[in-house]
């Protein structure tokens, strides 16, 4: 058993058939040292007597909040969440595996630029009952501090018959150095409660592996004269590290109709511009990636041909 | 070049070359990006290598002020990864397929290092910790793990001679 | 499978012009992007221009400009160049590919062989 | 236009060994190069596109690497078929232009 919080305890339980559970002595805090009596949640059920109260946490039922009173009075409160190790392995039922970019992925985290500011989200299916804590830090043996905001709902949306929730979060590193080759990597705890199940997930990542620029700006055509051919220019995006002759993108452009089958035309460019050819009916699109590290592409930015 | 009196280096030639050199080092192992290496353990094989730090000057106000102490690190690095890839725990069993990259961009962390450091002056070097591997199994994991951080050094260098070339250049 | 058949040789005068047809099957005529390239006997590959099928839009060399047609007829899925004004020096095989994409060539004819000569 | 000089104009190389054909472009090309290879009288046919992204149903033995200006095709193991000549082709603007080639012959 340790404490989460303040009157918050996790108690740790090998979780199969019969098994034993762990046995958990609660102490109630107080100086009174007799006409001590505990309750479970809203029962009035008396557990126990006694400044101390010993029981054998085996499931779900054994937890919740237990409380100590005198005489009518709450003296304090210990609430037991559970933690479920099944075939040596803690359970992930809270969170939705995203599968993306390998198989058991709960937490997914991006970063815009090299500033040492990311955002990390995940999913689940439960609606209520549900809270999230978020810590974080740069390495673990000897930790450099980073900054999490409140996880906070960013999305739902209808999968089949079940609604899924997305929570995100903001963090910042608080001595970012952009310019560094990063040789600890970040580490992600997130704590999760629904009603009295606990689990905790984690992820560990370099800066340099969740960058996603955001898309080119200000796209702009220009048509050549007596040519199907057309210059399109575009910016970087605001969000991305400064200067750009030190973190500089490269760009990928393409022309295509609405169908990813059509036929299309595509250049990559170092350059905030590039000559392709306009089709009726078709769309030019650039999308962004850092030229030297091969992280993600940004989202594609479009404009139509016509 | 950069040499002793603090000329600058071939900006240009060098931004070039470490360009190349990220290509290489991501064609060299580009499945190295889909394994999640840390979770392999044993960090302390890769901890030596020589990472460019906050302190290095290697940021573009570092290299506005005096882009030496940054030049000097990157050579350090250049030197030490060209040291690993000769080693045996690239040129030991298993033997890497035919055409693997690994030797061009063996020779090109080498021209890159001797364009910043002409002959008759040296830098002092950092020292190649003995890594020698038992299993092929380690020694392919090694690799993996050395490739991984040689994308992330050049990544920075290619970011250094890039800037250079572009506003430091006479 | 995607197949292109090209027409067959042709001799021809100087200042004569020559129209090579290219046959498309296996896949839907205006999905592809067809290009004409040509190859002089011993020389390398010379890239003359693309047609849309879809709509007729052409691109040629700077080189073929005024002396070369791209056209294609979708009812019999065939394309044609048509070059004129013939030279020795246009003696060559003459390719056409295809490609989705349209910067490069995933599918070719087997070539037709254009000899200038008086 | 762009010219693409291919080196070396031939290259004679055992069955077995490793063969490297180099190109390189008049000006920064990003990886905008496709490779091509041709045998005596057939059309020439696709290996490689956009650098490095292989084709299917080409043996893995062929492989591209670079950026911007210099170019690499590799074929780590050569087999009797792959003795013929390769092209590269820029395709970073028009017109389209292709390098003279590289002969891979028998030694």
């Known amino acids: 058993i340790w404490e989460l919080k303040k009157d918050v305890y996790v108690v740790e339980l090998d979780w199969y058939p019969d098994a034993p559970g762990e046995m958990v002595v609660l102490t109630c805090d107080t100086p009174e040292e007799d006409g001590i009596t505990w309750t479970l949640d809203q029962s009035s059920e008396v557990l126990g007597s006694g400044k101390t109260l010993t029981i054998q946490v085996k499931e779900f039922g054994d937890a919740g909040q237990y409380t100590c009173h005198k005489g009518g009075e709450v003296l304090s409160h210990s609430l037991l969440l559970l933690h479920k190790k099944e075939d040596g392995i803690w359970s992930t039922d809270i969170l939705k595996d995203q599968k993306e970019p390998k198989n058991k992925t709960f937490l997914r985290c991006e970063a815009k630029n090299y500033s040492g500011r990311f955002t990390c989200w995940w999913l689940t299916t439960i609606s209520t009952d549900l809270t999230f804590s978020v810590k974080s830090s740069r390495g673990s043996s000897d930790p450099q501090g980073v900054t999490c905001g409140a996880a906070t709902l960013s999305a739902e949306r209808v999968r089949g018959d079940n609604k899924e929730y997305e929570y995100s979060v903001e963090c910042q590193e608080d001595s970012a150095c952009p310019a560094a080759e990063e040789s600890l990597p970040i580490e992600v705890m997130v704590d999760a409660v629904h009603k009295l199940k606990y689990e905790n997930y984690t992820s560990s990542f370099f800066i340099r592996d969740i960058i996603k620029p955001d898309p080119p700006k200000n796209l702009q055509l220009k048509p050549l004269k007596n040519s199907r051919q057309v210059e399109v220019s575009w910016e970087y995006p605001d969000t991305w590290s400064t200067p750009h002759s030190y973190f500089s993108l490269t760009f990928c452009v393409q022309v295509q109709g609405k169908s990813k089958r059509e036929k299309k035309d595509r250049v990559f460019t170092d350059k905030t511009s590039a000559t392709v050819i306009c089709r009726k009916n078709a769309s030019i699109s650039v999308r962004a990636q850092d030229r030297y590290y091969s992280s993600s592409w940004s989202e594609w930015a479009s404009v139509p041909c016509s | 070049r950069a040499v002793p009196g603090g000329s600058s280096p071939a900006w240009t030639q060098c931004q070039q070359l470490s360009q190349k050199l990220c290509t290489l080092a991501w064609s060299a192992h580009p499945l190295v990006g889909h394994m999640d290496l840390r979770e392999e353990g044993d960090e302390e094989t890769t901890n030596d290598v020589p990472h460019i730090q906050c302190g290095d000057g290697c940021d573009p106000q570092g290299l506005r002020d005096n882009s030496q102490f940054c030049l000097q690190r990157i050579h350090q690095g250049l030197i030490f990864y060209e040291k690993l890839l000769g080693s045996d725990i690239f040129t030991g069993e298993p033997s890497l397929l035919p055409d693997s990259p690994v030797g061009q961009l063996h020779a090109s962390l080498l021209g890159l290092s001797q364009l910043l450091q002409p002959e008759g002056h040296h830098w002092e070097t950092q020292q190649i910790p003995s890594l020698s591997p038992s299993q092929p199994w380690q020694r392919l994991l090694l690799r993996f793990k050395i490739l991984r951080s040689l994308q992330a050094f050049v990544a920075v260098a290619a970011r250094v001679f890039a800037h250079g070339a572009a506003t430091l250049s006479p | 499978q995607v197949q292109l058949v090209q027409s067959g040789a042709e001799v021809k005068k100087p200042g004569a012009s020559v129209k090579v047809s290219c046959k498309a099957s296996g896949y839907t005529f205006t999905d592809y992007y067809l290009h004409w390239v040509r190859q002089a006997p011993g020389q390398g590959l010379e890239w003359m221009g693309w047609?849309?099928?879809?709509?007729?839009?052409?691109e040629y060399a700077p080189k073929f400009q005024g002396r070369v047609t791209m056209t294609t007829d979708t009812s019999t899925s065939t394309a044609y160049m048509e070059l004129r004004s013939l030279r020795s020096d246009d003696t060559a095989v003459y390719y056409c590919?295809?490609?989705?994409?349209?910067?490069?060539?995933?599918?070719w004819g087997q070539g037709t062989m254009v000899t200038v000569s008086s | 236009e762009i010219v693409m000089t291919q080196s070396p104009a031939t290259l004679s190389v055992s069955p077995g060994e490793r063969a490297t054909l180099s190109c390189r472009a008049s000006q920064s090309i990003s990886i905008n190069l496709h490779w091509y290879q041709q045998k005596p009288g057939q059309a020439p046919r696709l290996l490689i596109y956009f650098a490095s992204q292989s084709i299917s149903g080409i043996p893995a033995r062929f492989s591209g690497s670079g950026s911007g200006t210099e170019f690499t095709l590799t074929i780590s193991s050569l087999q009797s078929e792959d003795f013929a000549v390769y092209y590269c082709?820029?395709?970073?603007?028009?017109?389209?232009?292709f390098g003279g080639g590289t002969k891979v012959e028998i030694k």
């Open positions: 047609i849309d099928p879809e709509n007729g839009d052409t």
């Open positions: 590919a295809a490609n989705k994409e349209l910067r490069y060539f995933d599918v």
């Open positions: 082709q820029q395709s970073n603007s028009f017109p389209l232009t």
